[in-house]
Interface confidence: low
């Protein structure tokens, strides 16, 4: 999906008002220094591409973030503020329904959500800061 046509300011507002809080809730009890941020993005469409990938694509050790509250709100924001996004996600959603809900927050999932927090922060300051 091409994220260049999204309403970035509306998505930013959704992140600041709810998504950020849900990410913090998910990470509660984890030290902010526990994970190193290895994923970055250089502008807002690029950030949304990476955010979508980490939020909705199952990875080894963390298969089902998509049913978390922050993920559902992310999906809603993208569906509302990115023209045509919903249509591209129909197949992905059908595949997701076949997966079982995660019962335990694994360390891999915590690491992945930590990466997501970094991507969302970069989305709000969209320039790749190479350390």
């Amino acid at each position: 999906y091409d994220f260049t046509n999204c309403d970035f300011e509306k998505i930013k507002a959704a992140y600041l008002s709810t998504i950020s809080k849900d990410l913090i809730t998910y990470m509660s009890g984890t030290k902010s220094t526990e994970f190193n941020n290895t994923v970055s993005c250089s502008n807002r469409p690029h950030c949304l591409t990476e955010i979508q990938s980490l939020t909705f694509n199952p990875t080894a050790g963390c298969a089902s973030l998509a049913k978390e509250m922050f993920a559902m709100k992310t999906k809603a924001a993208l569906a509302i503020w990115c023209p045509g996004y919903s249509e591209t996600q129909i197949n992905a959603t059908q595949a997701m329904k076949k997966r079982r809900k995660r019962k335990v927050t694994t360390n891999k999932c915590l690491e992945q959500v930590s990466q997501l927090q970094g991507l969302w922060r970069r989305f709000n300051r969209p320039l790749l800061k190479q350390q």
Epitope: S42, N43, R44, P45, R125, P126, L127, L128, Q130
Partner: antibody, heavy 117, light 107 residues
Framework: QVQLQQPGAELVKPGASVKMSCKAS????????MHWVKQRPGQGLEWIGV????????TYNQKFKGKATLTVDTSSSTAYMQLSSLTSEDSAVYYC??????????WGQGTTLTVSS | DIQMTQSPASLSASVGETVSITCRAS??????LAWYQQKQGKSPQLLVY???TLAAGVPSRFSGSGSGTQFSLKINSLQPEDFGNYYC?????????FGGGTKLEIK
């Protein structure tokens, strides 16, 4: 409306330094990145570097590291670029320009730097 | 660094004609390309960003297209105020680089 105000010209001697200014108005200064771009007479555009006014983070084009230093004064919404050890190669028009996603939507009028003895 | 190659370097056309300027990136920059117009003695003005999105206030006779490494700027029905220099610039990642420019002159 958004404005980036730059002095029209600077005349300096070879080997000296110059600090040029760019005063921003009409928007929240700390919400946008401030870039500097060089244009030699009859030539194209060269990106020098960028500063984030919210935290003063800077990144430079490798070619201008050691030559340009970017700073800001958030109290006056002003960005500065200092150029050191000036030579005739530094004679050019220097623009400040702002961005959010790496493209430049508003530009200053440019400061013409002349390096001459 | 990503190199941007613009062609042609100069172009002569008449009022009312349609012209195209092309820009090639040395590597994939997806849709992260901007176009600027610069008139003699003036600052550049943003025309197009994200390869195809027109900047505010830019007439609809301007249009951008392309993705990946090949891009173009098309100007339909040239007007006298359209003559000047045009530059492409990738905004994919630092360092940002510009094309060498295209000088559009009146025939």
């Amino acid at each position: 409306q958004v404005q980036l105000q730059q002095p029209g010209a600077e005349l300096v001697k070879p080997g000296a330094s110059v600090k040029m200014s760019c005063k921003a108005s009409g928007y929240t200064f700390t919400s946008y990145w401030m870039h500097w771009v060089k244009q030699r007479p009859g030539q194209g555009l060269e990106w020098i570097g960028v500063i984030d006014p919210s935290d003063t983070y800077t990144t430079y084009n490798q070619k201008f590291k050691g030559k340009a230093t970017l700073t800001v004064d958030t109290s006056s919404s002003t960005a500065y670029m200092q150029l050191s050890s000036l030579t005739s190669e530094d004679s050019a028009v220097y623009y400040c320009t702002r961005s959010l996603d790496g493209f430049f939507d508003y530009w200053g009028q440019g400061t013409t730097l002349t390096v001459s003895s | 660094d990503i190199q941007m190659t613009q062609s042609p370097a100069s172009l002569s056309a008449s009022v009312g004609e349609t012209v195209s300027i092309t820009c090639r990136a040395s590597e994939n920059i997806y849709s992260y390309l901007a176009w600027y117009q610069q008139k003699q003695g003036k600052s550049p003005q943003l025309l197009v960003y994200f390869a195809k999105t027109l900047a505010a206030g830019v007439p609809s006779r301007f249009s951008g297209s392309g993705s990946g490494t090949q891009f173009s700027l098309k100007i339909n029905s040239l007007q006298p105020e359209d003559f000047g220099n045009y530059y492409c610039q990738h905004h994919y990642d630092t360092p940002w680089t510009f094309g060498g420019g295209t000088k559009l002159e009146i025939k």
